[in-house]
């Protein structure tokens, strides 16, 4: 009875979600086994997000618009674990959007979900950030390691998608 | 005020290469947005080929994507179009123009465009 | 691609009259859709960004609205000048993709 109503809820929150989300997969997590974390298909998950690559080129405003859209947000990385998981799915002759702008152009980042930047976690390139004007962050693969560069806000860029994980 | 100047043959036999050059004054090329070549064929139908950008990267319209190459020389603050193995299809007028203004919300500042007619 | 389709083709209007091009785009936009002005032998001349912002030094007879797929540009009160050919191009996703034109003729 009680695994019964369980299964209950969680189609009923499936049906929820699948009006956002056509197709979620989901995988049993718990030291039970009995929660289900699910990540949109074709999304990839990571600890507690899921992640999207948008290979669509949109100025840094849209494609944070873009992920918005999908209940996500451009890509805050807050660890070198997540960020080696993002780019196995990354091309190394394109750059990304990340969730990271200096929208004054005074040196002060910020994360667009107001994660406190922190200096002592970042993984810009050697001689990055190098211009006020560049107000936006990318990931590329630059001098055989993958970092960030500050870049022209406007110029239309791929980007990376993150939202949390639907628990269910 | 930045001003964009296309200049190159306006004619160009079937087969060949057509290259082109927009002359940028005003702002340098190297300093911010991107830098685009579109054409308008015969018929007034408007087409984006592709751009390269003020850090030199590129981005070419799939539908040209073997025959294009966009390039620059920062020195003279040009920006240079070239399409292989031209047909009659690519006569058009070829504007240069830039792109990123209003947050890339449209584009404000064109060339005054050059016809190149491809005929034997 | 996200394809344009800008109507009507052609259009005749006279002097001081009231005239509306719309442009239909084949996925949601968000808005990020532009218009121009083309005289003959000429480049094009941004007249709206973003739907609805005018360009600087643009009458304010000019108007854009719309929002996701259908998108409208008015012209109130023609004037001489205003004839010509006019353009849409969405702005959201690279290629930007244009209308196939809108030819204002006067009546």
């Known amino acids: 009875n009680f695994m019964y109503s369980k299964t209950v809820k969680r189609l009923s929150k499936l049906q929820e979600y699948q009006q956002y989300y056509p197709s979620l997969t989901c995988v049993m997590e718990g030291k039970d086994m009995e929660d289900w974390s699910c990540c949109p298909t074709p999304w990839t998950s990571f600890q507690s997000s899921c992640y999207f690559i948008s290979t669509v080129m949109q100025s840094w405003t849209k494609s944070q618009n873009n992920c918005s859209v999908m209940g996500a947000d451009l890509v805050v990385i807050n660890t070198k674990e997540e960020q080696d998981f993002i780019t196995q799915n990354l091309k190394i002759n394109s750059a990304y959007f990340l969730g990271l702008s200096d929208p004054k152009g005074w040196r002060h980042w910020q994360w667009v979900d107001q994660t406190p930047y922190n200096k002592n976690v970042t993984f810009w390139h050697s001689g990055e950030p190098n211009s006020p004007d560049e107000r936006c962050a990318i990931i590329n693969f630059r001098s055989e390691e993958w970092g960030w560069n500050d870049v022209h806000c406007h110029v239309p860029q791929k980007s990376i998608c993150k939202m949390k994980k639907i628990y269910i | 005020d930045v001003q964009l100047q296309e200049s190159g043959p306006g004619l160009v036999k079937p087969s060949q290469s057509l290259s082109l050059t927009c002359s940028v004054t005003?702002?340098?090329?190297?300093?911010?947005?991107?830098w685009n070549w579109i054409r308008q064929f015969p018929g007034n139908k408007l087409e984006c080929m592709g751009y390269?950008?003020?850090?030199?990267?590129?981005y070419y319209n799939p539908s040209l994507k073997n025959r294009i190459s966009i390039t620059r020389d920062t020195s003279k603050n040009q920006f240079f179009l070239s399409l292989n193995s031209v047909t009659t299809e690519d006569t058009a007028t070829y504007f240069c123009?830039?792109?990123?203004?209003?947050?890339?919300?449209?584009?404000?500042?064109w060339g005054q465009g050059t016809l190149v007619t491809v005929s034997a | 691609d996200i394809q344009m389709t800008q109507s009507p083709a052609s259009l005749s209007a006279s002097v001081g009259e009231t005239v509306t091009i719309t442009c239909r785009a084949s996925g949601n936009i968000h808005n990020y859709l532009a218009w121009y002005q083309q005289k003959q032998g000429k480049s094009p001349q941004l007249l709206v960004y973003n739907a609805k912002t005018l360009a600087d030094g643009v009458p304010s007879r000019f108007s854009g609205s719309g929002s996701e797929t259908q998108y409208s540009l008015k012209i109130n009160s023609l004037q001489p000048e205003d004839f010509g050919n006019y353009f849409c191009?969405?702005?959201?996703?690279?290629?930007?993709?244009f209308g196939g034109g809108t030819k204002l003729e006067i009546k």
């Open positions: 390269i950008s003020y850090d030199g990267s590129n």
């Open positions: 191009q969405h702005f959201w996703i690279i290629p930007y993709t």
């Open positions: 123009v830039r792109g990123g203004d209003y947050d890339d919300g449209g584009f404000a500042y």
């Open positions: 005003g702002y340098s090329i190297t300093s911010g947005y991107y």
